[in-house]
Interface confidence: low
């Protein structure tokens, strides 16, 4: 490590004094210090002498001696004060530039260490510092504003109390630059635009950044538009706004519009599409099948997508029958807007009752006219079964009626013993009726079918069962012949209430 003579950390001299600073090292040595006049440098191998015959306040500062060849990079320093009664400050720089949240050193060096007790930092014209300006002072280095903020970009003066009066340094301009996180933030409004030919339209492209140095432009189908720019400073951000006003749109105005902003960090862009149409339009669609089948007691949501311009002037859900004149409750109808020109309308039908099967129509109106979209809702029912004993053309016949939706299939079973339901072990015979006679089949109603089983002789210790099933469920009816006549009953479990 080099050694400095005189071997003191600080040296205090008067203006005009002769000062000699000698540095000795193992190899060649170099001096580094504040730029100031009147110094003479003399080097002799491993020593270097810095001297002046006329010290001034401008020589105040820290002088460091280094040994370039030293692998450890050791150095020695001495601080020189040239205490000039008229010049308490030696300002090394009149402009300091830092980024936000960095420490800003204002390099006003005190020329007399005795003055340290009376120093202060002020803004020019005697204005106090900003509230919560956190700073410290070092007589060797000056004032440090810790974690400087953009708003602290001001002109400062260092003040020292000399003989009862304040003596100011020349001013130091602090420039605190915003740390620019990236390209400017962008908004392009609206995100989508539709207009009828001849109408007015407005497209607004705006960009904002913490720093004022950025550019923004609006382009139409890759052509840059010449639009006056409005500038503003709001919420600690600079804003630049481009507003395109079109009094009467035509087809050539349609197309892609891009808002582009750039700064030193890069470029951002966002786009929207402008559609010009000849006349108003209203389109209804659904992602659902318009023919719906739901099991009775379950719920269903009917959804309609609407694309329209201009906006809707009216809309409603209507029940078209056939069962009753009830109308959907408004509270079950819900509307959501996907964007300006697309909407979704939902009709919620919870716990569907038999009387709610039928046609539901969504109607909407705008200046383009009325449009409607109709759903057909059929309810599914598990089969209901009944069996009677009768004579047809003189033959004893079991007649099974089954109603449900979809159309039920019918199976007859004959089993031993008297039972409410034949199980596999008891079954004597099984007949499938692939083509039962359809008695009724109206839209939105249950389908009723009839199956006949001709029985020459009823076996009294046996049970005849008619079973019907469809995709929803199954139903059955057991017929038990008894000596006094025939006895029929459904299984105990079969009590259907929708």
């Amino acid at each position: 490590i080099p050694v400095i003579e005189p071997s003191v950390p600080e040296l205090v001299v008067k203006p005009g004094a002769t000062v000699t600073l000698r540095c000795v090292g193992n190899g060649s040595v170099e001096w580094d210090g504040p730029p100031s006049p009147h110094w003479t440098l003399y080097s002799d191998g491993s020593s270097s002498i810095l001297s002046t015959n006329n010290a001034t306040f401008q020589n105040t500062g820290t002088y460091r001696c280094t040994e370039p060849g030293d692998p450890l990079g050791g150095s020695a320093a001495i601080h020189l004060y040239v205490k000039d009664p008229a010049r308490p400050w030696n300002v090394l720089a009149q402009e300091v530039v830092v980024f936000e949240d960095q420490d800003a050193l204002l390099p006003c060096l005190l020329t007399d260490p005795v003055l340290e007790a009376g120093v202060s930092l002020v803004r020019v014209r005697g204005r106090p510092l900003m509230r919560h300006t956190n700073y410290s002072f070092s007589p060797w280095h000056g004032f440090t504003i810790h974690r400087a903020k953009f708003i602290q970009s001001q002109d400062y003066q260092c003040s020292a109390l000399m003989g009862g009066r304040k003596v100011m340094s020349i001013s130091i301009r602090l420039k605190v630059q915003k740390v620019i996180p990236g390209p400017p933030a962008l908004t392009l409004v609206p995100a989508e635009l539709v207009r009828i030919r001849g109408e007015a339209a407005q497209i607004v492209c705006s960009a904002s950044s913490v720093d004022v140095n950025f550019d923004v432009f609006l382009q139409h189908n890759n052509t840059k538009l010449a639009i006056p720019q409005q500038s503003d400073f709001h919420n600690n951000r600079y804003q630049k706004v481009l507003t395109l006003n079109l009094d009467q749109v035509d087809f050539q105005h349609a197309g892609n519009y891009s808002c582009v902003a750039s700064n030193v960090q890069g470029k951002h862009s966002t786009s929207m599409f402008f559609r010009v149409v000849e006349s108003a339009y209203l389109n209804l669609s659904s992602e659902q099948n318009l023919i719906q089948e739901v099991t009775v007691g379950e719920g269903l949501n009917l959804k309609v997508m609407v694309e329209a311009y201009p906006g809707l002037q009216g809309f409603n859900w209507t029940y078209l029958g056939p069962f009753s004149d009830h109308q959907p409750e408004p509270k079950l109808a819900n509307a959501t807007t996907k964007d300006t020109y697309r909407h979704t309308f939902t009709l919620s039908l919870p716990r569907l009752k038999p009387s709610e099967a039928g046609r539901y129509s969504f109607l909407a109106r705008n200046p383009g006219g009325w449009r409607a979209l109709t759903f057909e809702l059929t309810l599914r029912y598990p089969p209901e079964v009944s069996v009677i004993w009768t004579f047809i053309n003189g033959s004893g016949t079991l007649l099974c009626a089954a109603s449900g939706y979809p159309q039920p299939n019918v199976t007859w079973l004959q089993c031993s013993g008297h039972t409410d339901r034949c199980d596999e072990a008891q079954v004597l015979q099984v007949w499938d009726d692939p083509y039962p006679e359809v008695l009724s089949q109206e839209p939105f109603h249950k389908v009723t079918v009839q199956s006949l089983l001709t029985v020459e002789t009823l076996e009294h210790n046996q049970t005849y069962e008619c079973r019907a099933h469809n995709s929803v469920g199954s139903g059955s009816w057991a017929f038990i012949p008894i000596s006094a006549g025939a006895h029929t009953h459904p299984p105990d479990e079969f009590l259907f209430t929708p």
Partner: antibody, heavy 121, light 107 residues
Framework: QVQLQESGPGLVKPSETLSLTCTVS??????????WSWIRQPPGKGLEWIGY???????NYNPSLKSRVTISVDTSKNQFSLKLSSVTAADTAVYYC?????????????WGQGTLVTVSS | DIQMTQSPSSLSASVGDRVTITCQAS??????LNWYQQKPGKAPKLLIY???NLETGVPSRFSGSGSGTDFTFIISSLQPEDIATYYC?????????FGGGTKVESK
């Protein structure tokens, strides 16, 4: 945080000098980084800054009162004082002393409770 | 000197009301503006510093905004203890000057 307490005569005759003292506790008038201010408020009116003394001893006064005002510090008693000469009835007011942390610039972070001074013969 | 014009000079409001006070500086003062609350017989108390920053311990129903020459002070939901006179004060240039005050009374 420092506490401040004003003291001085509540009645001063016209053309005389109004003298008030502010005693500081919980801090030192000579410690770095404080502005010690005086503010006044005429009855039913707004607030008017009179001036401050910096911890280093430098002062700054309201130009409208500068010719009549002196603010000084007595470090041995941990006090600072206000002298307002040639008073008139217009100087009747509640006088507040206040402390401001130099780094904040507000000048008035902490206030005394105020003392009413009436100028009357 | 920088003149600070405060309005209104007084207002009546009910508990729960939103109260807005404005302060206008005669020249640009950046955001070197404070707001104080003063209750009868008491010294002013600092509520907002640097135009929009809430002093420690002050309820969040108080807020401030603005920059340059136009500033706003808001009490979002007036409480009985907020009945007082409110002052704005600039510290951009010496001498520091105060607005004329706004007396907030109970309706």
């Amino acid at each position: 945080q420092v506490q401040l307490q004003e003291s001085g005569p509540g009645l001063v005759k016209p053309s005389e000098t109004l003298s008030l003292t502010c005693t500081v506790s919980g801090g030192s008038v000579s410690s770095g980084g404080y502005y010690w201010s005086w503010i006044r408020q005429p009855p039913g009116k707004g607030l008017e800054w009179i001036g401050y003394i910096y911890y280093s001893g430098s002062t700054n006064y309201n130009p409208s009162l500068k010719s009549r005002v002196t603010i000084s510090v007595d470090t041995s008693k941990n006090q600072f004082s206000l002298k307002l000469s040639s008073v008139t009835a217009a100087d009747t007011a509640v006088y507040y002393c206040a402390a401001g942390i130099a780094a904040t610039g507000t000048l008035f972070d902490c206030w005394g409770q105020g003392t009413l001074v009436t100028v009357s013969s | 000197d920088i003149q600070m014009t405060q309005s209104p000079s007084s207002l009546s409001a009910s508990v729960g009301d939103r109260v807005t006070i404005t302060c206008q500086a005669s020249q640009d003062i950046s955001n070197y503006l404070n707001w104080y609350q003063q209750k009868p017989g008491k010294a002013p108390k600092l509520l907002i510093y640097d135009a929009s920053n809430l002093e420690t311990g002050v309820p969040s129903r108080f807020s401030g905004s603005g920059s340059g020459t136009d500033f706003t002070f808001i009490i979002s939901s007036l409480q009985p203890e907020d009945i007082a006179t409110y002052y704005c004060q600039q510290f951009d240039n010496l001498p520091p000057t105060f607005g004329g005050g706004t007396k907030v009374e109970s309706k």
